[in-house]
């Protein structure tokens, strides 16, 4: 006897006569001379249990065959698939008045699974079944089973189960297979929501609304719903679920992010590689851990690289004027990978004899534009005490400085108020200009106000407009500025320093480097 057969996923078989081992044992009425259970051989000489009747010689046949009780398993509509062979009445001798070529299909709902007798009046007719083809002996002779297949449905059903019955009215027929099934929309996952096996509705046009549940490691975005159609197909998916943070969709599931990857939010995005200077060591990371010495600010997105505090500002210049000090500096060489760099000024008042004995300047000192959070690289400090040593620290800070403050992030200068600095240098000359260098010379300030300790040359490309300058210090009154770019305009300033501090810068000297070497003697005017 053939074993279980494979049917579509949206069909649930309640009865399959071909899968029954041994005799079917259905109830026939009359017990003799009507339907008879007969073994036939299929093409592979495998026995198949069939029910046959061929009472074609007598009129007014009324032969009934009833199945065993069939549970409906909650189905409201069931389908009956009948595979049968019907013999052409013309192929049977002398039976033209009595032979028929149809049979009738009936059903009876019952909660009783052990009804022993067929009561015809209890049964409701489903349909009259006619063959699409009827066969003569010629058709059957080749041993290949030629079957008609008819499917009928019945519903709505309400009792625990039902019986089917076949009424023969004088045909020559073999029921080769009777299969009863209902349709369901099979368990499925759509938009990361799982929808359970759902039995179709009672009507052939009904839609059953089903709420889905989010798959593991996901959460609802919009309430997931689908409709189970009468044919067992899912229709109109609405809403969806999103994989939780640390998970991404793969084949309808939410899989944990692999090591080295992360996902910060419940979105439909995939896991992303950890940003620069960060790592993850576990699967399912929602963020990546910063490398040693690197940090993430509170308001940094998980997708941003980890950064570090900046290095110290460069080229700090001070200019003392009685009880005021002007400080100027350049941006740090390393910003730590961040754009949010700012500067804080720390003012310390130090003892004359012991510079290590310093204390905060206090609230009487004023800073322009401000003391902390400076975006520019200069500050004016006023209302200092006269004849006092001050140390000023310029701290470069960014969004992660607080996680790792270090002296390496600051530069300092010590000045004494109320000591006269040298006057400005009146004349700066370009003695020689080449493609890559300028030789400068200048005169001592008119009023040195003491021993000049050194001169400071500040220069920058003209079109940089002092945003990025360089400093060269020398004890002589001349210097060669090397490493310049050809055919580029540079601006030079020079000032002197004594023990009292720096004087003012000279007026700017503008020099353009050559393409061909030549000697130019400047007189303080712009040289080209």
């Amino acid at each position: 006897v053939t074993g279980s057969r494979v049917y579509p996923a949206n069909e649930v078989t309640l009865l399959d006569s071909r899968s029954v081992q041994g005799e079917l044992g259905w109830i026939a009425s009359p017990l003799e001379g009507g339907w008879e259970e007969v073994s036939i051989m299929d093409e592979k000489n495998t026995p198949i249990r069939t029910y046959q009747v061929c009472n074609v010689m007598e009129a007014s046949q009324n032969n009934w065959l009833r199945t065993d009780w069939i549970t409906r398993e909650g189905a409201q509509r069931v389908y009956i698939e009948i595979k049968f062979t019907l013999r052409d009445c013309n192929s049977l001798p002398g039976v033209m008045g009595t032979c028929k070529e149809t049979f009738n299909l009936y059903y009876y709902e019952s909660d009783n699974d052990k009804e022993r007798f067929i009561r015809e009046s209890q049964f409701g007719k489903i349909d009259t079944i006619a063959a699409d083809e009827s066969f003569t002996q010629v058709d059957i002779g080749d041993r290949i089973m030629k079957l008609n297949t008819e499917i009928r449905d019945v519903g709505p059903l309400s009792k625990k189960g039902f019986y089917l019955a076949f009424q023969d009215v004088g045909a020559c027929i073999a029921l080769v297979s009777v299969r009863v099934f209902y349709k369901k929309c099979p368990l499925t996952v759509r938009n990361l929501a799982q929808f359970p096996d759902t039995i179709t509705g009672a009507d052939t046009s009904s839609l059953v609304e089903v709420r889905g549940s989010c798959v593991n490691n996901s959460e609802e975005k919009d309430v997931p719903k689908m409709y189970c159609g009468a044919d067992g197909e899912w229709l109109v998916p609405i809403g969806n679920c999103l994989c939780n943070a640390g998970h991404e969709e793969q084949n309808g599931e939410c899989q944990a992010c692999k090591i080295g990857y992360y996902k910060a939010l419940s979105t439909d995005a995939s896991c992303a590689k950890c940003p620069p200077h960060s790592y993850s060591v576990w699967e399912g990371a929602t963020s990546c851990t910063c490398d040693r010495g690197f940090f993430r600010a509170d308001n940094d997105a998980a997708s941003m690289p980890c950064t570090r505090p900046p290095s110290a500002p460069l080229n700090l210049i001070s200019n003392v004027n009685e009880t005021s000090v002007n400080l100027e500096w350049s941006s740090p060489q390393n910003t730590g990978g961040r754009q949010d760099i700012s500067y804080n000024v720390v003012c310390k008042k130090c003892g004359a004899g012991d510079p290590s004995k310093c204390r905060p300047c206090g609230s009487g000192v004023h800073y322009t534009p401000q003391q902390n959070g400076l975006k520019t690289t200069r500050v004016s400090i006023t209302d200092l005490l006269a004849h006092t040593n001050y140390t000023f620290e310029i701290w470069a800070v960014n969004g992660v400085s607080k996680y790792n403050p270090s002296p390496d992030q600051s530069v300092s200068v010590t000045v004494t108020t109320n000591q006269a600095a040298p006057s400005s240098i009146a004349l700066v000359q370009a003695k020689e200009v080449t493609r890559y260098s300028v030789a400068l010379a200048w005169l001592e300030p008119d009023r040195p106000n003491g021993v000049i300790l050194e001169y400071e040359v500040k220069y920058y490309e003209k079109d940089q407009n002092e945003r990025s300058y360089r400093i060269v210090r020398t004890a002589a009154r001349n210097t060669d500025i090397k490493g310049l770019n050809p055919l580029t305009s540079y601006v030079f300033h020079v000032r002197a320093r004594t023990a009292a501090g720096y004087g003012d810068f000279s007026e700017p000297l503008e020099v353009t480097t050559n393409t061909v070497p030549s000697r130019i003697i400047g007189d303080g005017a712009n040289s080209t």
């Epitope: 003799e32 001379g33 007969v38 036939i40 051989m41 299929d42 046959q52 061929c54 009472n55 074609v56 010689m57 007598e58 009129a59 062979t85 019907l86 013999r87 049977l92 001798p93 002398g94 039976v95 009595t98 066969f135 003569t136 002996q137 010629v138 059957i140 002779g141 041993r143 089973m145 020559c172 027929i173 073999a174």
Partner: antibody, heavy 121, light 106 residues
Framework: QVQLLQSGAEVKKPGASVKVPCKAS????????MSWVRQAPGQGLEWMGW????????TYAQGFTGRFVFSLDTSVSTAYLQISSLKAEDTAVYYC??????????????WGQGTLVTVSS | EIVLTQSPATLSVSPGERATLSCRAS??????PAWYQQKPGQAPRLLIY???TWATGIPDRFSASGSGTDFTLTISRVEPEDFAVYYC????????FGQGTKVEIK
């Protein structure tokens, strides 16, 4: 159970007639055709023909027309084979057999025990 | 009239062996033959009809196949009670029997 009961052996002289009865039981007599089959001593089976028990319409095989007549008495569920002008070569066992029509083919599914008719002078 | 020829006339087999009986029609027939078994002193018994249907109570070691003019009855493993004469029979407008094959103990 379904049975076909035939009469005992008959000994007849050449030229005589014989009527062999076949009484059916255990099923509706008029629902199945009845066939007649002859088997001469030591020989194989020969199909003689059949009769539609519902209409009484007979069909005879080649070689069995004229002297052979199939008839019925449905009131007693009995089929008859009558052979007239018996010849020595008619000596044989005569079987009645119920015809089974099915979707997949026909056959004779229930047989009588046979009636031996001996024709001898 | 269609003539059915059975072969061999006698087939000697041992119990448990496979037996294959042939039935050849003189012309192509529209249907597969029925097969009968007859033991000495008994009426014939229907085995298989329409080439695909076992008669009531017939074990499935008996099977039939073929089409057109050549047909076969196969006994997969011969049992002691299977030794008998076997006839094929063609049905249609006129029915005819083959002359029979005797299956005897080897």
């Amino acid at each position: 159970q379904v049975q076909l009961l035939q009469s005992g052996a008959e000994v007849k002289k050449p030229g005589a007639s014989v009527k062999v009865p076949c009484k059916a039981s255990g099923y509706t007599f008029t629902s199945r055709a009845m066939s007649w089959v002859r088997q001469a001593p030591g020989q194989g089976l020969e199909w003689m023909g059949w009769i539609n028990t519902n209409t009484g319409n007979p069909t005879y095989a080649q070689g069995f027309t004229g002297r052979f007549v199939f008839s019925l008495d449905t009131s007693v569920s009995t089929a008859y084979l009558q052979i007239s002008s018996l010849k020595a070569e008619d000596t044989a066992v005569y079987y009645c057999a119920r015809v089974r029509f099915t979707v997949y083919g026909d056959g004779m599914d229930v047989w009588g025990q046979g009636t031996l008719v001996t024709v001898s002078s | 009239e269609i003539v059915l020829t059975q072969s061999p006339a006698t087939l000697s087999v041992s119990p448990g062996e496979r037996a294959t009986l042939s039935c050849r029609a003189s012309q192509s027939v529209s249907s597969n033959p029925a097969w009968y078994q007859q033991k000495p002193g008994q009426a014939p018994r229907l085995l298989i009809y329409g080439a695909s249907t076992w008669a009531t109570g017939i074990p499935d070691r008996f099977s039939a196949s073929g089409s057109g003019t050549d047909f076969t009855l196969t006994i997969s493993r011969v049992e002691p009670e299977d030794f008998a004469v076997y006839y094929c029979q063609q049905y249609g407008p006129s029915w005819t029997f083959g002359q029979g094959t005797k299956v005897e103990i080897k």
